[in-house]
């Protein structure tokens, strides 16, 4: 029976990260799915000494073990503010409320001899109010607050007497509340009661180190639960028609290596020692997991007891939250890796316990106590957990019928006391009225309940369509390092040789014969030949690459021009053109590791020195003169909005460098416009790094403003002066000024003089946008002398999204939003996406890249067809990868094609994503014929 769960880790087959079963699932939960929220009595009720309530073991524990925590002072006070709790439940729109009855509030000394009338009145009022609101109560009989008297008189759960005492208490509850309660939980997470209560001492009663006591307590808890189940089954179920279970908590664990059987067995043991300890007897064969019985510590079940215990749950109530993960001594990891994969645990439960009906009766995470209503990370944890549950239901056919978000209100968090918060509603414990303020997570959960899941795809439906036939399909390379001499010696040696093929395979010179030599040709450069082969394979129409300024002008001025290098670049262009591949050439492409400036310019201050702008103009003119007859698309500077960040000693350096870069670009544009455009008929722009931004938390206004600010500080910073107004964005100027006034920044944005403003305004012939991802941003007041601090923006990683190894989120719709934003905010010009790509570790079948390409092209197509964006070209990033860098290339560093090459070439051949039955695109032959010999003849 048990042990089947091990198959979870045995599954050797690889599932692609872009397989729909692994991606975020946009779908709804089953129609009758139950949405709820839970609390624990001791955590929220307060009034610990009021209205006749007796002390519990936790009252004593707080006093004796949790220094500096005065349990009676600070609480959520649910006992007093029942109405406020009900309003909170109304706000969420839940269909059930899971709460626990405080045993010592009902029976102050633990025995059922005399009930506490005020306590009884409270629970009656709570239940009546829930019924009135059509909210199903799920009632937990024991959530850790054992009457202190029972601990002192009997030793608590170490004593088997507790079994009958618990049954008496349960009987009273069934008799008194059973007409209104259809779902009962006997004990909440017995593992923690035993382990922390008697092993680590981190929970009440705070005993530690006695493993025999730990297992005895576990044994008694199981038997107590079993007795209550039989009692309910025989005496109450026939007329009350309810269900009863026990909430079992667990962690999840992944093996270090799935192909290592020892690791897999350790994982199975780790799960069995926590969840299996209680689940195996109750949901399994009535006994403890085999491997737990090897030590003499664990008590034995007699055959009759096994029979009695087995099957004593009407559904599987499961808890998955921080209490089973932290602190680190909570579970035995057996050298493996804990994981928050709720979907996998549910699969393990399904395999291990014969596909039970499951109620998730506690799930959620925690935030730090200083966080009030803006619990952004809690939203993402909830989103992640809930989607895992949905995937488990839809893909794995796991029978989850309800979900309990934990918890309704901030309250007492056991060993963490008040240092963490888990509520959907914020409560200021020091306030009089203890108002319940909905946190972002409450708004989010409310929305989930309303929608019954995630019905709304983030993107609009996919569409079929094509880009026009003059659309540029390109691939981008960063700096193309030149070959300084030709690599093929062919035709430069005048001698004739005989090849001893059958013998020693050596070449022998034939004396007295001299052949004619010829000057080297473009095809003699091996790297160009390789490059052209790659471009041919991809079927691109355009190739973007950057010149190496330092190689062309080592001294930074025209005193020393490396003609060999210029010739190499001319060869790259001309060989591409022979193939019908048009160049887009970048003059200056700095990278984070290399500023790319000739050394003398670097030494004299780089872009902080205006002389660099003059040197750049001279360099640009040289390039226009030497290559401009062949090159019709020029990029002056690649991503100046990122380059300036490298001048980050102070924000003022950053802004000054940016200012100088804009002027340098503008001067080059005017130079081309005046001298070269009339004869060369090309176009000049600069490319900006243009990631999109979205608020990380849509329920917080400051996040929307932060996203807006990100776009202004990141893109409009350069786009406004160059594309539109000749000045920095007003948002940027005003925000920096306001930070200055408040003493939070000492930044000074340079001023454009009237002359500079005229110089820079409108100095692009097209928009060149490099776009890779969408950033999820939060407002965070920053106070440093770096320019990035001026924007008060921080990024948040959305754990639910498909992301690359370097943590770039795959958010295709961001590119459509960006394109629409550019169209709205700037003049309606042609737009090229000059770099779009992702890193993917796969060296052959790069599935993330293929998925990324398809989805991003799809959104660009929508921008073109629906949003009327004048998108003229799409350049995938990048052709080859560098040995040391994250893997962005279509080809490996030794020029082997990955499967994305074929995928992209198919996109190009189709001119987009046409309907299946459409005729071939743009004069392509009907069948795609690949000529193998052609690549040798190039």
């Amino acid at each position: 029976f048990s042990g089947d769960g091990k198959a979870i880790w045995d599954k050797k087959q690889y599932v692609s990260p872009v397989n729909p079963s692994q991606l975020f699932l946009y779908d709804t939960f089953p129609k009758n799915f139950s949405w709820g929220v839970g609390t624990g009595a001791f955590q929220v009720e307060g009034s610990w000494k009021t209205d006749g309530r007796g002390p519990s073991i936790w009252d004593r524990y707080v006093y004796s073990h949790l220094r500096g925590v005065n349990g009676t002072d600070r609480s959520t006070d649910s006992y007093i503010f029942l109405e406020k709790d009900l309003l909170a439940l109304d706000f969420l729109g839940v269909s059930f409320y899971q709460f626990s009855i405080s045993w010592p509030r009902l029976f102050p000394n633990g025995t059922v001899a005399a009930v506490n009338a005020q306590g009884l009145r409270y629970y009656r009022a709570l239940l009546d109010s829930l019924v009135l609101r059509n909210i199903e109560p799920i009632v937990t009989l024991y959530h850790w607050d054992l009457p202190l008297t029972l601990q002192e008189e009997y030793g608590g759960w170490k004593n088997a007497t507790m079994i009958d005492l618990f049954n008496d208490y349960a009987t009273y509850c069934f008799q008194t509340f059973g007409d209104r309660v259809k779902y009962w939980i006997t004990i909440h997470n017995p593992y923690l009661v035993a382990w922390h209560g008697f092993g680590t001492g981190m929970h009440a009663p705070g005993e530690k180190g006695n493993l025999t006591a730990v297992y005895t307590v576990g044994h008694n808890l199981i038997k107590a639960h079993s007795k209550v189940w039989h009692n309910y089954d025989k005496n109450f179920r026939p007329h009350q028609k309810g269900w009863l279970s026990i909430t079992l908590g667990s962690h999840w664990i992944e093996p270090n290596r799935t192909d290592n059987m020892e690791d897999v067995i350790n994982c199975q043991h780790s799960m069995s020692s926590v969840l299996g300890w209680f689940a195996n007897p109750i949901h399994g064969d009535g006994d403890y997991p085999e491997f737990m019985k090897t030590g003499a510590m664990i008590p034995e079940f007699s055959e009759a007891e096994k029979e009695e215990v087995r099957g004593t749950a009407d559904f599987f109530a499961f808890s998955f939250g921080p209490n089973n993960f932290r602190p680190s001594n909570t579970v035995v990891k057996m050298g493996q890796n804990v994981s928050l994969n709720l979907r996998q645990v549910l699969n393990w439960i399904k395999l291990e316990y014969d596909d039970p009906q499951i109620l998730i009766s506690e799930n959620g995470w925690f935030t730090d106590s200083y966080i009030k209503t803006e619990d952004t990370t809690a939203i993402y944890m909830m989103k992640n957990f809930l989607n895992q549950v949905l995937q488990a239901i839809k893909f794995d056919e796991i029978r989850v019928f309800g979900y309990t978000a934990w918890t309704l209100l901030d309250g007492f968090e056991w060993q963490d006391a008040y240092t963490t918060r888990r509520g959907l509603f914020y409560v200021d414990f020091n306030s009089e009225q203890k108002e319940r303020k909905p946190k972002s997570s409450a708004h989010y959960y409310k929305q989930i309940i309303q929608d019954n899941g995630f019905p709304l795809k983030e993107s609009t439906p996919d569409m079929k369509g094509r880009f026009p036939c003059d659309f540029s399909w390109g691939v981008t390379e960063s700096v193309l390092k030149p070959e300084f001499t030709v690599s093929s010696p062919q035709f430069t040696d005048p001698h004739l040789y005989v090849w001893n093929v059958t013998g020693n395979r050596l070449l022998y010179r034939v004396e007295g014969v001299r052949l004619k030599t010829r000057p080297s040709q473009c095809t003699d450069y091996v790297s160009i030949k390789k490059r052209v082969e790659m471009l041919a394979k991809m079927k691109v129409t355009h190739y973007q690459f950057a010149l190496d300024w330092t190689s062309i002008l080592p001294t930074g001025n025209l005193s020393k021009v490396n003609r060999q290098v210029l010739r190499y670049y001319r060869c790259v262009v001309s060989e591409g053109l022979k193939l019908g591949v048009f160049p887009m050439v970048t003059l200056y492409h700095p990278t984070h590791s290399h500023l790319g400036l000739p050394l003398p310019l670097l030494s004299s201050g780089g872009w902080l020195n205006m002389n660099t702008a003059k040197a750049f103009q001279d360099y640009a003119e040289l390039c226009f003169r030497e290559l401009g007859d062949l090159v019709k698309l020029w990029i002056t500077i690649n991503e100046p909005n990122r380059l300036s960040d490298m001048y980050n000693r102070t924000s003022n350096d950053t802004y000054r460098a940016a200012h100088n870069l804009m002027i340098a670009h503008a001067q080059v544009w005017h130079l081309y416009d005046r001298q070269y455009r009339p004869v060369q008929h090309g176009a000049v722009s600069l490319s900006l790094h243009c990631d999109w931004a979205e608020p990380a938390n849509p329920f917080v206004d400051s996040h929307w403003k932060a996203a807006e600010r990100f776009l202004q500080f990141e893109i409009a910073w350069f786009a406004d002066p160059l594309f539109k107004t000749g000045d920095y964005p007003s948002v940027m100027k005003e925000y920096i000024a306001s930070k200055n006034q408040r003493g939070l920044s000492s930044s000074v944005l340079p001023r454009f003089t009237a002359k500079e403003s005229r110089l820079v305004k409108g100095t692009v012939d097209f928009y060149a946008l490099n776009h890779f991802t969408t950033r999820f941003v939060i407002h965070k007041q920053l106070n440093t002398n770096r320019s990035v601090a001026d924007r008060d923006v921080q990024f948040l990683q959305d754990i639910t999204r498909l992301s690359s190894p370097s943590r770039l989120a795959v958010t295709p719709w961001g590119v459509r939003k960006l394109l629409a934003w550019i169209r709205r905010n700037y003049r309606d010009r042609d737009i090229y996406i000059t770099a779009n790509g992702i890193d993917d570790l796969a060296l052959e079948d790069d599935q993330i890249r293929k998925y990324y390409l398809e989805k991003y092209v799809q959104e660009a197509l929508k921008a073109y067809l629906i949003d009327k964006v004048k998108i003229k070209g799409y350049y995938a990033f990048k052709l080859t990868e560098e040995k040391s860098k994250p893997r962005f290339g279509f080809f490996t560093s030794d020029f082997r094609a990955k499967s994305s090459v074929q995928f992209y070439s198919k996109l190009i051949s189709s001119s987009g994503l046409p309907a299946e039955n459409r005729s071939p695109a743009c004069g392509q032959p009907a069948e795609d014929t690949d000529c193998t010999i052609c690549s040798f003849l190039v």
Epitope: P695, W704, N825
Partner: antibody, heavy 120, light 111 residues
Framework: QVQLKQSGPGLVQPSQSLSVACTVS????????VHWVRQSPGKGLEWLGV???????DYNAAFISRLTISKDNSKSQVFFKMNSLQTTDTAIYYC??????????????WGQGTSVTVSS | DIVLTQSPTSLAVSLGQRATISCRAS??????????MTWYQQKPGQPPKLLIY???NLQSGIPARFSGSGSRTDFTLTIDPVEADDVATYYC?????????FGGGTKVEIK
């Protein structure tokens, strides 16, 4: 404070053109888009089109053949021209400022409206 | 075009009571995680005035007794409690898709 002042004729002959100018103050047309909306007793509020801060325009497809919106940023003026008016085009014509945020598509300030009657 | 249907067309409410206006769209007005639904108030002889944007966000300067909610195709404007100054016609408007469209309006009067 933000203002949009409209000027234009009250009466237009059938088949003639309607031209309305909208002069804005306290905000820049390089930062905010301007929408045109009309209101008639028969058809309620109808969105006609918009000129965005960058100068690109979007029109309601029902009016695209006879509508032109343009602007002069330096004069803070937006121009609305609709050709071939019929009696059914009788309405109050409003120019209105776009909210101006990337993440909000709404109109936050309206002009006083130009009441246009199409009649011979 | 997306058609917005408002109900009721007119509504008489006692002072201090709650007024609820519904707006139903012929197709979803949500995309890319945003709810493109806006509410305006128009008093006789005046242009419309922005109350709520993105379905639930209160425009600055608008009293907190106005609130918006809803998702996909069903949206609600609530005024609670209603004051004498709230007598007006209320319009919903979607901007998820061109052309932007408005509801037919709901006239609120005091009982």
């Amino acid at each position: 404070q933000v203002q949009l002042k409209q000027s234009g004729p009250g009466l237009v002959q059938p088949s003639q053109s309607l031209s309305v100018a909208c002069t804005v103050s306290d905000f820049s047309l390089t930062t905010y888009g301007v929408h045109w909306v009309r209101q008639s007793p028969g058809k309620g509020l109808e969105w006609l089109g918009v000129i965005w801060s960058g100068g690109s325009t979007d029109y309601n497809a029902a009016f695209i053949s006879r509508l032109t919106i343009s602007k002069d940023n330096s004069k803070s003026q937006v121009f609305f021209k609709m050709n071939s008016l019929q009696t059914t085009d009788t309405a109050i014509y409003y120019c209105a400022r776009d909210y101006g945020s990337t993440y909000v598509d709404a109109i936050d300030y309206w002009g006083q409206g130009t009441s246009v009657t199409v009649s011979s | 075009d997306i058609v917005l249907t408002q109900s009721p067309t007119s509504l008489a409410v006692s002072l201090g009571q709650r007024a609820t206006i519904s707006c139903r769209a012929s197709e979803s007005v949500e995309s890319y995680g945003n709810r493109y639904m806006t509410w305006y108030q128009q008093k006789p002889g005046q242009p419309p005035k922005l109350l709520i944007y993105r379905a639930a966000n209160l425009q600055s300067g608008i009293p907190a007794r106005f609130s918006g909610s809803g998702s996909r195709t069903d949206f609600t404007l609530t005024i609670d409690p209603v004051e004498a100054d709230d007598v007006a016609t209320y319009y919903c408007q979607q901007s998820n898709e061109d052309p932007w469209t408005f509801g037919g309006g709901t006239k609120v009067e005091i009982k």
